[in-house]
């Protein structure tokens, strides 16, 4: 969380942003809140990106003002207009690109004063892994697949029974470039698995960490997976 204060002639207002990550090809949110004003027409929101030749987005007098928007953001940005009055200046970014990564500034002017706060926005690709029993293999084998990752992640296997065991010798991980030539499909195979055990396939890069669990017993297979974004700090 980053909290910024204005320092100019009028009073300062508190602006709060949260560092976040965008999944390339999907829509993302750059979060920003501020002390609300009673009149929408008195609120100006400017989103800036470090080193960019124009504005990312501007909202003033109750509507978008995009005459100074930089070409790389044209047609891809929107604020939540109905929520501005309650202090939400968050920006929706459509079709996140790798090049959208960087430092952004949420700059607010209201009748109470001015304020701004920066946020770090990371971009990459991350997806939920799915772990299955590979019945085609000659021995008991698990196959962990995740369709989209970037940058290239690390893959680590763990087991509930053999806690702390190193499975690198009995696993094989491959990365296959997807058709858009940026993201990659992750496939990891774990050999010599035993029943009545829970295995976890953990995929991690500097943006996200995802885990796929599988519990194999004589009578059933249970799966669970979750994904966590890393470094979500508020300003």
């Amino acid at each position: 969380l980053i909290i910024g204060f204005g320092i100019s002639g009028r009073h300062s207002i508190t602006v709060t942003t949260v560092a976040s990550a965008g999944n390339i090809g999907e829509d993302g949110i750059l979060s920003c809140t501020f002390e609300p004003d009673i009149k929408l027409s008195d609120i100006v929101i400017q989103w800036l990106k470090e080193g960019v030749l124009g504005l990312v987005h501007e909202f003033k007098e109750g509507k978008d003002e995009l005459s100074e928007q930089d070409e790389m953001f044209r047609g891809r940005t929107a604020v939540f207009a109905d929520q501005v009055i309650v202090g939400n200046a968050s920006l929706r970014l459509k079709n996140v690109q790798l090049t959208d990564a960087g430092t952004y500034k949420c700059y607010i002017i209201t009748s109470k004063g001015k304020g701004n706060a920066n946020l770090e926005y990371k971009t990459g690709a991350f997806s939920m892994p799915e772990v299955n029993v590979d019945y085609n293999a000659s021995s008991e084998t698990l196959r962990c697949e995740a369709p989209r990752w970037f940058p290239q992640p690390t893959v680590v296997w763990a087991s509930q029974v053999d806690q702390g065991a190193n499975f690198s010798e009995v696993s094989n991980t491959s990365f296959e470039l997807n058709s858009e030539n940026v993201t990659m499909k992750v496939v990891s195979v774990l050999y010599n698995v035993t029943i009545n055990n829970t295995y976890s396939c953990m995929i991690e890069n500097d943006i996200a960490k995802a885990t796929g669990d599988i519990k194999v017993t004589e009578s059933e297979i249970k799966r669970r997976s979750h994904l966590q974004l890393l470094n979500s700090k508020a300003s």
């Epitope: 400017q46 080193g51 960019v52 030749l53 504005l55 100074e68 928007q69 070409e71």
Partner: antibody, heavy 122, light 107 residues
Framework: EVQLLESGGGLVQPGGSLRLSCAAS????????MSWVRQAPGKGLEWVSA????????QYADSVKGRFTISRDNSKNTLYLQMNSLRAEDTAVYYC???????????????WGQGTLVTVSS | DIQLTQSPSTLSASVGDRVTITCRAS??????LAWFQQKPGKAPKLLIY???SLEGGVPSRFSGSGSGTEFTLTISSLQPDDFATYYC?????????FGQGTKVEIK
């Protein structure tokens, strides 16, 4: 200390090509847009081209559009200007300048190189 | 592209004079205007950005004002070091443009 050092100028024939470089130091290069500005002998300043910090956006003056290409290599802290189909009227001292960090909120053209002379003549 | 017109082209003044240079834009540029000083054989020096913000290290006798299409640079009391050529410059999301320059010379 911020420093910008241009190189690559010289004498070239009309229709020829030249590539200017600008080596930057003393600041986080990728955080700033960069520009090229030129000044013909005894004339005023003319902005030529600009490029965003990440290299994703570029701008050109109408007089050079389609002939000049601006680029940057952030790993080398270097700005470039590829000049093709050169004309006599392109003769000038070419400056690289540090452009904005934050559009509308920060200084721009606050640091300049010493300039490199490009002469287009047969 | 946006055109900038400076006036006058040349200005003769004496030390201690109050000097005003005008810059007009062909369309509204809000406050996206900077002022530069250039001396012969030297690179330009930034004086004012965002129409009225004084660059660090620049003497307070320099000031800028205006918004939209009309801008002014004022030197409240001209000093010997101030004889030079002054340029306005607009910046927006698709271009930058300089004015043609105003030469301030000794009367």
């Amino acid at each position: 200390e911020v420093q910008l050092l241009e190189s690559g100028g010289g004498l070239v024939q009309p229709g020829g090509s030249l590539r200017l470089s600008c080596a930057a130091s003393g600041f986080t290069f990728s955080s700033y847009a960069m520009s090229w500005v030129r000044q013909a002998p005894g004339k005023g300043l003319e902005w030529v081209s600009a490029i965003s910090g990440g290299g994703g956006s570029t701008q050109y003056a109408d007089s050079v559009k389609g002939r000049f290409t601006i680029s940057r290599d952030n790993s080398k802290n270097t700005l470039y200007l590829q000049m093709n189909s050169l004309r006599a009227e392109d003769t000038a001292v070419y400056y690289c300048a540090r452009d904005i960090q934050w559009f509308g909120e920060s200084t721009l053209f606050d640091y300049w190189g010493q300039g490199t002379l490009v002469t287009v003549s047969s | 592209d946006i055109q900038l017109t400076q006036s006058p082209s040349t200005l003769s003044a004496s030390v201690g004079d109050r000097v005003t240079i005008t810059c007009r834009a062909s369309q509204s540029i809000r406050s996206w205007l900077a002022w530069f000083q250039q001396k012969p054989g030297k690179a330009p020096k930034l004086l004012i950005y965002k129409a009225s913000s004084l660059e660090g290290g620049v003497p307070s006798r320099f000031s800028g004002s205006g918004s939209g299409t009309e801008f002014t640079l004022t030197i409240s009391s001209l000093q010997p070091d101030d004889f030079a050529t002054y340029y306005c410059q607009q910046y927006n999301s698709y271009s930058r443009t300089f004015g043609q320059g105003t030469k301030v010379e000794i009367k």
